[in-house]
């Protein structure tokens, strides 16, 4: 058993049929010695008396809010949560496996630049009685500070018969140099509590590996005289690290119709313009990627050919 | 310890070209190592990230773009002294800071070159003959060093009398390639910045 926060405790349980469970001793936070009784949740049934209560925690029915009273007055609470371990593996029931970039990916993180600011998100099908808390650091043995905000519900989607909820959190490394060469990864830890179930999820990464620039901005087309070709130009996204001559981007320019199966024109360039062949009903799209360290491509910025 | 915005310098172009080749060569070699040593811990997640130049050179700080010198977090520089004459610097007006930056890059390359050559000598003794260093990568390191053209003491190649542990050597190769790729990215950024300045 360990303390998650004041008056909230996590009991770690090996979860298998007829498991013996864990013996837990609760102590009432009071100077009083006599006349103390214990109850669980909203029940008025007295579970025991005295300053301490010893319980055998085996299942969710044994978890919950234990309260000690004296003469009708509440003295203190202890909330017990369960953390299940099945076949030596901690449960991951609360969050959905996003399977990208690999299986057992519950947290996904992205950074728009090298400033040390990043966003992580996760998915769940649970809509109520759910809380998250996020901690982060650079390195684990001698951790350096990363400050994270509160996790918020950022999107709701319908997937077949199920509703899916996306939560996200923004974090900022306390003293980040955009030009630094990272040798210690960022660690992100998410505590998830659903009713009386506790789970924790972690992710470890270098900012350089989670870079995904915003799409290029200000796409413009200039038809070339006596030609089917157009010159397309664009600018670096505002959110990208500066100076741009140091933090350079490379671009992919594509002309395609509405369907992915349609024929297309595609060219890669380090410049902020390119010449492509435009077709009726097609659109020109441009995306960006760090020129020197190949992490993710940005989403496409698009303009119609016509 | 930073790069002022200098006058356009035709002498930077060869260094830019060589640094681009360097990044391509090390990235290619790292990819090859990851594929060949698929049953060794050779991915970024699996290896320890070591920097053999730590406390010996200060490339990131010495080559910091002017725009980032206002960032307190970028200025925890380590003081290191370097020789200052180089052929990438065509202009007499080249700043002392730029020379410091380029000589730091030169020292990095020299250290990695020695490590790689020592390692390759060991890998050539491996009866499995599983992986060797790409001669192209070694040649590109050499070309960039020549383009930088700094005079510096030659570092003797490490020789080892004991029987090499090939497993450890291959893991060390992965560690070295990952670190060198990161440094090659920095070098490429610096050359691009200097070229545009």
């Amino acid at each position: 058993i360990w303390e998650l926060k004041k008056d909230v405790y996590v009991v770690e349980l090996d979860w298998y049929p007829d498991a013996p469970g864990e013996m837990v001793v609760l102590t009432c936070d009071t100077p009083e010695e006599d006349g103390i009784t214990w109850t669980l949740d909203q029940s008025s049934e007295v579970l025991g008396s005295g300053k301490t209560l010893t319980i055998q925690v085996k299942e969710f029915g044994d978890a919950g809010q234990y309260t000690c009273h004296k003469g009708g007055e509440v003295l203190s609470h202890s909330l017990l949560l369960l953390h299940k371990k099945e076949d030596g593996i901690w449960s991951t029931d609360i969050l959905k496996d996003q399977k990208e970039p690999k299986n057992k990916t519950f947290l996904r993180c992205e950074a728009k630049n090298y400033s040390g600011r990043f966003t992580c998100w996760w998915l769940t099908t649970i809509s109520t009685d759910l809380t998250f808390s996020v901690k982060s650091s650079r390195g684990s043995s001698d951790p350096q500070g990363v400050t994270c905000g509160a996790a918020t519900l950022s999107a709701e989607r319908v997937r077949g018969d199920n509703k899916e909820y996306e939560y996200s959190v923004e974090c900022q490394e306390d003293s980040a140099c955009p030009a630094a060469e990272e040798s210690l990864p960022i660690e992100v830890m998410v505590d998830a509590v659903h009713k009386l179930k506790y789970e924790n999820y972690t992710s470890s990464f270098f900012i350089r590996d989670i870079i995904k620039p915003d799409p290029p901005k200000n796409l413009q087309l200039k038809p070339l005289k006596n030609s089917r070709q157009v010159e397309v130009s664009w600018e670096y996204p505002d959110t990208w690290s500066t100076p741009h001559s140091y933090f350079s981007l490379t671009f992919c320019v594509q002309v395609q119709g509405k369907s992915k199966r349609e024929k297309k024109d595609r060219v890669f360039t380090d410049k902020t313009s390119a010449t492509v062949i435009c077709r009726k009903n097609a659109s020109i799209s441009v995306r960006a990627q760090d020129r020197y360290y190949s992490s993710s491509w940005s989403e496409w910025a698009s303009v119609p050919c016509s | 310890r930073n790069l002022p915005v200098a006058t356009p310098d035709p002498g930077m172009f060869p260094c830019l070209h060589h640094s681009q080749n360097l990044l391509r060569a090390v990235s290619n070699m790292l990819q090859k190592a990851r594929q060949t040593l698929e049953f060794y811990p050779c991915t970024s997640e699996e290896i320890d990230h070591e920097d053999i130049t730590k406390d010996k050179t200060s490339t990131v700080e010495a080559c910091l773009p002017l725009e980032l010198t206002k960032n307190e977090s970028c200025l925890n520089s380590r003081e290191t002294s370097f020789i200052t004459n180089g052929s990438c610097l065509a202009s007499r007006k080249t700043s002392f800071m730029m020379a410091l930056c380029l000589s730091s890059i030169y020292e990095d390359l020299k250290m990695y070159q020695v490590e790689f050559k020592t390692m390759n000598a060991k890998l050539l003794m491996d009866p499995k003959r599983q992986i060797f260093l790409d001669q192209n990568m070694l040649a590109v390191i050499d070309e960039l060093m020549q383009a930088l053209n700094f005079n510096s003491e030659t570092v003797p190649q490490k020789s080892s009398l004991e029987e090499p542990d090939f497993y450890k050597t291959k893991i060390k190769l992965c560690i070295l390639l990952h670190a060198f790729r990161i440094r090659a990215v920095t070098i490429d950024r610096v050359m691009s910045y200097l070229n545009a300045s």
């Epitope: 024929k263 595609r266 060219v267 890669f268 | -």
Partner: antibody, heavy 118, light 107 residues
Amino acid sequence: EVQLQQSGADLVRSGASIKLSCTASGFNIKDYYMHWVKQRPEQGLEWIGWIDPENGDTEYAPKFQGKATMTADTSSNTAYLQLSSLTSEDTAVYYCNACKELRYFDVWGAGTTVTVSS
Amino acid sequence: DIVLTQSPATLSVTPGDSVSLSCRASQSISINLHWYQQKSHESPRLLIKFASQSISGIPSRFSGYGSGTDFTLSINSVETEDFGRYFCQQSNSFPLTFGAGTKLELK
């Protein structure tokens, strides 16, 4: 299966014209760009140009402007290359290509050998 | 027009050798470079697109890398079926152009 059937080898007199054909099977040429590439005996490859059969748009390499004319007939699923004022320099194998992407060649025909005699 | 220079013109190798073929562009072409193999009396076939992207059905011993002006096609452990000519082609701008080719022959 995506395939390109090119017309047979031809021997033509200097100064004459010739029209080569390239018939597609397994796909509709409207969904592809069609290119023509020239290869002279024991030499490299030269790009002649492309046509978009969907709308008839064409682009030629400057060297072949006036020498080559590309057309396409979507009803017969065939692309054509007409070469005019033939000289010995035009003796070559001519390949047609069907490309989902405009700028590289993923489906090649077997080629048509054209020999120009004086 | 963009000129592509391939080297060497001829490469004599023994099956099992690993080889690198070079293609250099007269100006920077990013990664807009593709590699083709042409065996005797056959049409060319696409091996690698955009400098390093593999093509389905092409053996994994073929790999490409490079960007800007310098490109390399590597064949890891040459097999007898690999002998023939290799061409690079740029798609950075029109007109599309090819290199003169490298002939890979049996030593």
